[in-house]
Interface confidence: low
């Protein structure tokens, strides 16, 4: 089965790439705008430049195109603990993160929210945090893994997971984390 | 098949150096953190040193710290740990370990390096 285009694919697709169909006369291709410019007027004929103007400030558009507006820019979450990492330019969206020592925890595709990355206080660092995960720690003995913090044992109830893991063990070496290391 | 292989061990004097390796296969190297344990003569296992993923936490046991350096070649699928001012009591079996992620220390050992530290 062939896959159903929509009108304005379909229309894209007679024309060379880099331009697209003029909607007004279907024998007519018009060269697409420059990312950062905007679709102002169609060209009025073959090898005729097309119309594109810069986008405005907070706006932008991020690839060639046939736009009759430019996009808004985003706006950092700052509910949701975002930073902006780079401001938005005529041909670039806002970047959005996190600050040092956090991680992005993705609520839906587009929103995330920043959390400290765990510290491992009584355990140690297995996988180091990540820009959207955070610290995996591993406790020392004595101590279980609740909410990616290490819990003392004395805090394990009977009916919880952890049971298992609080059974007396054999002494495990308790290392201190190098001071030279963050 | 998970294999680990020591290497670099040997016979040095007091107060030398030496750097152990472990060329490690069958997994995802930069997955999982590791680390190193011994066995001296007649005693009991030790741990030595462990070290995160990416490199970026180093563990020490109080009785290496400040002369053992664990590092990582994640490219090389390589664990190393550079030995200096080595002591009598350092003579042991070396041994790389790969951490589980869970509770439970490690779940694979390579087969050891010896080490001897004597004059």
């Known amino acids: 089965l062939v896959p159903h285009l929509g009108d304005r694919e379909k229309r894209d697709s007679v024309c060379p790439q880099g331009k697209y169909i003029h909607p007004q006369n279907n024998s007519i291709c018009c060269t697409k705008c420059h990312k950062g410019t905007y679709l102002y007027n169609d060209c009025p004929g073959p090898g005729q430049d097309t119309d594109c103007r810069e986008c405005e400030s907070g706006s932008f558009t991020a690839s060639e195109n046939h736009l009759r507006h430019c996009l808004s820019c985003s706006k950092c979450r700052k509910e949701m603990g975002q930073v902006e990492i780079s401001s938005c330019t005529v041909d670039r969206d806002t970047v959005c993160g996190c600050r040092k020592n956090q991680y992005r925890h993705y609520w839906s595709e587009n929103l995330f929210q920043c959390f400290n990355c765990s510290l491992c206080l009584n355990g140690t660092v297995h996988l180091s945090c990540q820009e959207k995960q955070n610290t995996v720690c591993t406790c020392h003995a004595g101590f279980f893994l609740r909410e990616n913090e290490c819990v003392s044992c004395s805090n394990c109830k009977k009916s919880l997971e952890c049971t298992k893991l609080c059974l007396p063990q054999i002494e495990n070496v308790k290392g201190t984390e190098d001071s030279g290391t963050t | 098949e998970v294999q680990l292989l020591e290497s670099g061990g040997g016979l040095v004097q007091p107060g030398g150096s030496l750097r152990l390796s472990c060329a490690a296969s069958?997994?995802?190297?930069?997955?999982?953190?590791m680390g190193w344990v011994r066995q001296a003569p007649g005693k009991g296992l030790e741990w030595v040193s462990q070290i995160s993923n990416t490199g970026d936490h180093t563990y020490y046991a109080d009785s290496v710290k400040g002369r053992f350096t664990i590092s990582r070649d994640n490219s090389k699928n390589t664990l190393y740990l550079q030995m200096n001012s080595l002591r009598a009591e350092d003579t042991a079996v070396y041994y790389c370990?790969?951490?589980?992620?869970?509770?439970?220390?490690?779940?694979?050992w390579g087969q050891g390096t010896l080490v001897t530290v004597s004059s």
């Open positions: 370990a790969k951490y589980t992620g869970r509770w439970e220390p490690f779940d694979y």
């Open positions: 069958g997994f995802t190297f930069v997955k999982y953190s």
